[in-house]
């Protein structure tokens, strides 16, 4: 807290300019009018105020706007945004995408801070849903943003926004998140032709059910092993050897290198060894010939 002292003669600030960096903390407090600061916030960013001087400026704005800053001030906070606490930001009502971009720019190239997370939360809640422009902006600054959301939060993403998603935006998504995103992607890309559709849907396939994988196997898509390894195990298990062969095309040879890893390992255990042998890859661990396969899950469902 800065002590209240009278402004020395001739030091009253007429505008926010670089002469203020030579003011001591108490002089800033006494000589800079909060309303003047608020209307000239855009100048602060261009002036190399010290860390302690920025404390004084923030204190003045807090006194002027105890209920939270108006968006006209927020948009021009610049690096003063980094002085804000999540509690400060929860008082804000940020509706403009330009304001959001301006503040994200200050944190560019760094991990999402609690302040940024709170800002985004306030912005998205204010909009009611994650529209395409917002998603475009957020994933540009934070490629992992989408995967930081809970499945519940992802459910508010409209299918039209899926067009903004790039493959790298989904790198850290877990199966639960892809389960929510996949149906939206399927809807978003439904009018595309076979090969174009596969290129777009590929990143989301970790949420695809068995029937969709079966349908893809009929379309000569040549899925790569990296994509195959990210598929849901429960979706892969019912696929036949012939379906997997069609799904992977020339990439089927990669199964040998992955035979000890899920979902390949579990899938092999469900296939007849005879069928696996037809691939000519030396995959071992299938059901020996002459054995009867009982579907215990079906039996449990009936009892």
């Amino acid at each position: 807290e800065v002590e209240k002292t009278a402004c020395p003669s001739g030091k009253k600030a007429r505008e926010i300019d670089e002469s203020l960096i030579f003011y001591k903390k108490w002089e800033l407090e006494a000589c800079v009018d909060a309303a003047l600061l608020a209307t000239q916030m855009d100048r602060v960013n261009a002036i190399p105020f010290t860390y302690e001087q920025l404390d004084v400026l923030k204190h003045k704005l807090d006194e002027l706007y105890p209920q939270g800053y108006p968006e006209s001030v927020i948009q021009h906070l610049g690096y003063l945004f980094l002085k804000m606490s999540p509690e400060d930001i929860r008082k804000w009502n940020v509706t403009s995408l330009e304001t959001l971009k301006a503040l994200l720019e200050v944190n560019k190239g760094h991990e999402m801070s609690p302040q940024v997370a709170t800002l985004i939360d306030r912005f998205v809640k204010g909009r009611g849903q994650l529209d395409k422009d917002t998603l475009d902006t957020l994933t540009a600054f934070y490629p992992g943003y989408l995967c930081s959301l809970s499945p519940e939060e992802l459910s508010s993403v409209p299918p039209s926004s899926i067009w903004a998603v790039r493959p790298q935006d989904l790198d850290t998504c877990d199966p639960r998140q892809l389960d929510v995103l996949y149906p939206k992607a399927r809807l978003a890309f439904q009018n595309m032709n076979g090969s174009e559709y596969f290129v777009k849907i590929q990143s989301f396939l970790g949420g695809a059910p068995t029937e969709d994988l079966k349908a893809l196997s009929q379309q000569n898509v040549s899925m790569d092993l990296a994509t195959f390894m990210k598929l849901r195990t429960d979706a892969v298990l019912p696929l036949t050897v012939a379906e997997v062969q069609k799904l992977l095309g020339p990439h089927v040879e990669g199964l040998k290198a992955e035979e000890r890893h899920r979902p390949v390992r579990d899938w092999i255990l469900r296939q007849r060894q005879d069928d696996l042998d037809t691939l000519g890859l030396g995959l071992q661990g299938g059901i020996p010939n002459g054995y009867l396969v009982l579907d215990l899950s079906m039996q449990e469902a009936l009892s």
């Epitope: 670089e18 261009a46 190399p48 010290t50 860390y51 920025l54 690096y79 980094l82 002085k83 200050v106 944190n107 560019k108 190239g109 760094h110």
Partner: nanobody
């Protein structure tokens, strides 16, 4: 981590000149501004000169026309050329830099003593 090492201080006669250098290392972020502060015996810290990333310079009234701040971006070094020195310029001079992207932080050197004898 960031280190600022000042050099060039010393004892000089009134009316003489000195050139202070500040070598910065460990910088992995865009620097917003470099500056020089001084602390005269028994007084508080006073900002003497500052140079922004874009090269804009600002000086305290007491040193205008006598001191010049400059920077060498290649070597991450900041200089303070001090001319027409007076006893009022005696003190410890500290180099400092501002980080304003990703986090707000000011980094300081250990200081170099400047003594102007009359």
């Amino acid at each position: 981590q960031v280190q600022l090492v000042e050099s060039g201080g010393g004892l000089v006669q009134a009316g003489g000149s000195l050139r202070l250098s500040c070598a910065a290392s460990g910088i992995t972020f865009p620097v917003n501004a470099y500056g020089w502060y001084r602390q005269a015996p028994g007084k508080g810290l006073e900002l003497v000169a500052i140079i922004s990333a874009g090269g804009t310079t600002n000086y305290a009234d007491s040193v205008k026309g006598r001191f010049a701040i400059s920077k060498d971006n290649v070597n991450n070094t900041v200089y303070l050329q001090m001319n027409s020195l007076t006893s009022e310029d005696t003190g410890v001079y500290y180099c400092y830099l501002q980080r304003r992207i990703g986090m707000l932080r000011d980094y300081w050197g250990q200081g170099t003593q400047v003594t102007v004898s009359s």
